[in-house]
């Protein structure tokens, strides 16, 4: 008799793929545009990325550091009207893209949560949650919660409102903290909270360090659903050299949890390459005309248009990974086992019951390495085969679909491999 199938876990929409943050509408659209109507015109692009949710804004009225002139129910007229927002929501729903609204109150000011009148601000947030839930938004984000006094209790209250409206609604909190204990204390009192932090932001050094950060986090959070990003708002290029971007895309898409990206991460958007552009929100490079300030500063391979036409580009890799992440059971909700593969390497298996399994091997170093996969680290339920098929490499030149002998696996500098193999009884 065939073994019984393992019961599928309950999956919410944010479990099924990546979230895409657009914190600055004007920078995202460029060319002096930057409103909700224009964003509606970019939804097809978001669909092509196969992302499940759009984290938008803040877009509410906020006069810098002025509580009285901050209205979480009013859209800043520079971004459009309530009607524009409703129209964006409807269009996004038709394309199965969920909309998460950032309600960080004082986003233009010094302290995101104001330095006084905490209770008034918290009440305004509570009212705004109810208002926008009824408007049809799918969730909320609040950032810089380390600046919010009694953050845990406020988050618990806001979570109650969000989940009380529908279990299908999401609350994301963001913190600049990279300290695991601080992160855990925020998570402790809030069961379903998705938390973005700077926890992984200094992981770029070695495979061992990254492995230890990831496994510590997963062990500490138990069976909680996690999110993976390098910060609560900033681009990957703020933390990583260009040669590690592909590696991190592969890792973020294949760890157990929700990957969260900022606009431009899919093309390696880098403020440092665009003189005069702000680090936190450089202009999105749709094509070579997106940054007219310095003629010739932008080449085709830095843009969405150029990368869309190149199957070997970062954008093409992003699209492929996003597609795999949203349809393979083992990547959607599979178990995770990290194991030793040699110095400089981070490797792990994702598997779910009798479904196809995935092996990820990441070389963080700048020298080529032979992987010594220590299968003995793995439980019997996750044993390695002798060979696995190469689904994709972060570097060009490998023949995809070909079987690779795992005992003789060699990785190029900064190369990541995603391999697949069948379940064997």
């Amino acid at each position: 008799r065939a073994p019984r199938c393992r019961e599928l876990p309950a999956q919410k929409w944010w479990h099924t793929g990546a979230l895409y943050r657009i914190g600055d509408l004007q920078a995202f659209q460029g060319h002096g545009a930057g409103n909700l109507a224009g964003l509606k015109g970019r939804l097809d692009y978001l669909s092509s990325l196969k992302v499940k949710g759009l984290v938008l804004g803040p877009i509410h009225k906020n006069q810098k550091d002025d509580v009285a002139q901050t209205d979480l129910l009013q859209i800043d007229p520079n971004f459009g009207s309530k009607e524009d927002f409703d129209s964006l929501l409807q269009s996004a729903k038709k394309k199965s893209i969920r909309v998460i609204l950032d309600l960080t109150p004082n986003y233009r000011g010094e302290n995101s949560w104001f330095s006084t009148q905490v209770d008034t601000v918290a009440t305004k947030v509570k009212d705004a949650l109810e208002f926008w839930l009824q408007a049809g938004v799918d969730g909320f984000q609040v950032r810089d919660i380390e600046n919010l006094k009694d953050a845990s209790s406020f988050l618990a209250e806001w979570q109650n409102i969000t989940k009380g409206f529908s279990e299908d609604r999401l609350l994301i909190a963001g913190t600049n903290s990279s300290d695991l204990q601080q992160i855990l204390s925020l998570l402790e009192s809030n069961k379903d909270l998705l938390l973005t932090s700077s926890y992984l932001s200094d992981s770029g050094s070695t495979g061992e360090h990254t492995k230890s950060l990831v496994t510590q986090y997963l062990n500490a959070t138990g069976n909680r659903w996690c999110s993976w990003s390098l910060s609560q708002a900033r681009l990957l290029t703020s933390f990583l050299p260009a040669q590690l971007l592909r590696l991190y895309q592969l890792m973020l898409f294949t760890l157990p949890g929700t990957p969260v990206f900022s606009y431009g991460d899919e093309i390696g958007l880098d403020a440092a390459a665009l003189p005069g552009q702000p680090m936190e929100a450089p202009v999105m490079l749709w094509d070579e005309s997106s940054f007219p300030d310095i003629p010739g500063a932008v080449s085709a391979n830095m843009t969405v248009k150029g990368q869309s036409e190149d199957p070997g580009s970062l954008l093409s890799l992003f699209r492929r990974l996003s597609d795999q992440r949203s349809k393979e059971r083992s990547l959607l909700h599979g178990d995770f086992h990290a194991f030793s593969a040699g110095p400089g390497l981070f490797s792990y298996i994702r598997h779910w019951d009798q479904n196809e399994r995935f092996l990820v091997v990441l070389n963080f170093g700048d020298v080529g390495l032979s992987a010594g996969l220590q299968a003995s680290d793995l439980p019997a339920s996750a044993s390695l085969p002798a060979k696995a098929d190469l689904l994709l490499s972060t570097q060009p030149g490998r023949e995809e679909g070909s079987p690779l002998e795992l005992e003789r696996l060699k990785l190029e500098p900064h190369e990541g491999l995603l391999l697949r193999f069948p379940y064997a009884a």
Epitope: K82, T120, K124, K126, D127, A128, F131, A135
Partner: nanobody
Framework: QVQLVESGGGLVQAGGSLRLSCAAS????????MGWFRQAPGKEREFVAT????????YYADSVKGRFTISRDNAKNTVYLQMNSLKPEDTAVYFC??????????????????WGQGTQVTVSS
């Protein structure tokens, strides 16, 4: 159960002012989001303004923004609509409504479980 009774309507010249009141009895008033809607002859009922249970947050229809002010007094179980710079197109029956599920009401009338009978406001030119 919540009972709502509006008052304060009447005939006024364009540019004039009126203050509508809505007295609530029954279920805990201070935990209800409250709203004002209006219906002109031959037209559908439309949203005017809403206020959160604490009175901290308010939201207005674009057509009345800057002219109308919604407020509430939880000690008196009453919500108000101060209407200034009235225009002939403000002529309608004004209804007060209570949302017993949300502390912050919304712009759609289906969210409101309890309604008053309405008070007529007529603005002549």
């Amino acid at each position: 159960q919540v009972q709502l009774v509006e008052s304060g309507g009447g005939l006024v010249q364009a540019g004039g002012s009126l203050r509508l009141s809505c007295a609530a009895s029954g279920r805990a008033f201070s935990s209800n989001g409250m709203g004002w809607f209006r219906q002109a002859p031959g037209k559908e009922r439309e949203f005017v303004a809403t206020i959160s249970c604490s009175g901290t947050s308010t939201y207005y229809a674009d057509s009345v923004k800057g002219r109308f002010t919604i407020s509430r007094d939880n000690a008196k179980n009453t919500v108000y609509l101060q209407m200034n710079s009235l225009k002939p197109e403000d002529t309608a029956v004004y209804f007060c409504a209570a949302d017993t599920r949300h502390c912050m009401g919304y712009t759609k009338d289906e969210g409101y479980a309890y309604w008053g009978q309405g008070t007529q406001v007529t603005v002549s030119s």
